[in-house]
């Protein structure tokens, strides 16, 4: 599981491999912090809960930020 | 509200490829999946796949696998079914339709969740007839 | 040959309640929702039921669905002619990677 404690950041490695958007239970978006300097994208899949941390620059992530951020001002008081 | 607007009628002969565009309007396209099916005269509907267009992936039948590619230009929000080798079996009428759609809860939190719910096809096109004759 | 399995008609009077079944596998219903489309004769289909039992917005509460292991049924109460349409259920299949559907149930309103 590409995931730890010990550093900062949660992402200790990141998967390029495309995700099969029917294979995903959900995203989780952490968004750079004083703790970690860069946005972290994990993806929870379906099958055996297995998590994935995702690269926040290729197109399909950089694409779902941008829907996020763009929902978010929508529905921000 | 996302409507779907299919591209018209085409008559084609044995042996070549057709291309079926699908444009969507009042939505975010990338923000849903967008599935292509079928129905032949006098027979139910088939599905032959999907794409989301977000993550650039599709997904096919297997019956129609090698011979249907789909795809999205998400610059004009547009999705497209092009089946090559066309037979007179694969005269049909042709629908697109959205399916899939991204969720975002815990959005104003500095952690929010994505999640795609596949809850049927609510949004479909008209349709494009399709011909294959000699 | 369809994956799920559907009666090919069904029939009843104004005001009568019919019941639609679809018969699956633990691949597709067994593991995953079921959902409904009606089709009106020269029409694109229209979601009926999605999730088993939920209705879109602007779906009359006449129509109902459920799912009990392999098996999904869709519930028309209070019948009406403009019912008289094709009506078709479907699901995923984990096995087929793929949407599947049932062949079809032409309800005619006698």
């Known amino acids: 599981v590409p995931l730890s404690r010990t550093v900062r950041c949660t992402c200790i490695s990141i998967s390029n491999q495309p995700v099969n958007p029917r294979s995903l239970e959900k995203l989780e978006i952490i968004p750079a912090s004083q703790f970690c300097p860069r946005v972290e994208i994990i993806a929870t899949m379906k099958k055996k809960g297995e998590k994935r941390c995702l690269n926040p620059e290729s197109k399909a992530i950089k694409n779902l930020l941008k829907a996020v951020s763009k929902e978010r001002s929508k529905r921000s008081p | 509200q996302v409507q779907l607007v299919q591209s018209g009628a085409e008559v084609k002969k044995p042996g070549s490829s057709v291309t079926v565009s699908c444009k969507a309007s009042?939505?975010?396209?990338?923000?849903?999946?967008i599935t292509w099916l079928r129905q032949a005269p006098g027979q139910g509907l088939e599905w032959m796949g999907e794409?989301?267009?977000?993550?650039?992936?599709?997904n096919y039948a297997q019956k129609f696998q090698g011979r249907v590619t789909i795809s999205a230009d998400e610059s004009t929000s547009t999705a497209y079914m092009e089946l090559s080798g066309l037979t007179s079996e694969d005269t049909a009428m042709y629908y697109c339709?959205?399916?899939?759609?991204?969720?975002?809860?815990?959005?104003?939190?500095?952690?929010?969740?994505?999640?795609?719910?596949?809850?049927?096809?609510?949004?479909w096109g008209q349709g494009t007839l399709v011909t294959v004759s000699s | 040959q369809s994956v799920l399995t559907q009666p090919p008609s069904a029939s009843g009077t104004p005001g009568q309640r019919v019941t639609i079944s679809c018969s699956g596998s633990s691949s597709n219903i067994g593991s995953n929702t079921v959902n409904w489309y009606q089709r009106l004769p020269g029409a694109a289909p229209q979601l009926l039921i999605y999730n088993n039992d939920q209705r879109p917005s602007g779906i009359p509460d006449r129509f109902s669905g459920s799912k009990s292991g392999t098996s999904g049924s869709l519930v028309i109460s209070g019948l009406q002619s403009e019912d008289e349409a094709d009506y078709y259920c479907a699901s995923w299949d984990d096995s087929l990677n793929g949407r599947v559907f049932g062949g079809g149930t032409k309800l005619t309103v006698l």
């Open positions: 009042g939505g975010t396209f990338s923000s849903f999946s």
């Open positions: 794409i989301t267009p977000m993550f650039g992936i599709a």
């Open positions: 339709a959205r399916d899939g759609r991204f969720d975002v809860s815990d959005l104003l939190t500095d952690k929010p969740k994505v999640t795609i719910n596949y809850n049927g096809m609510d949004v």
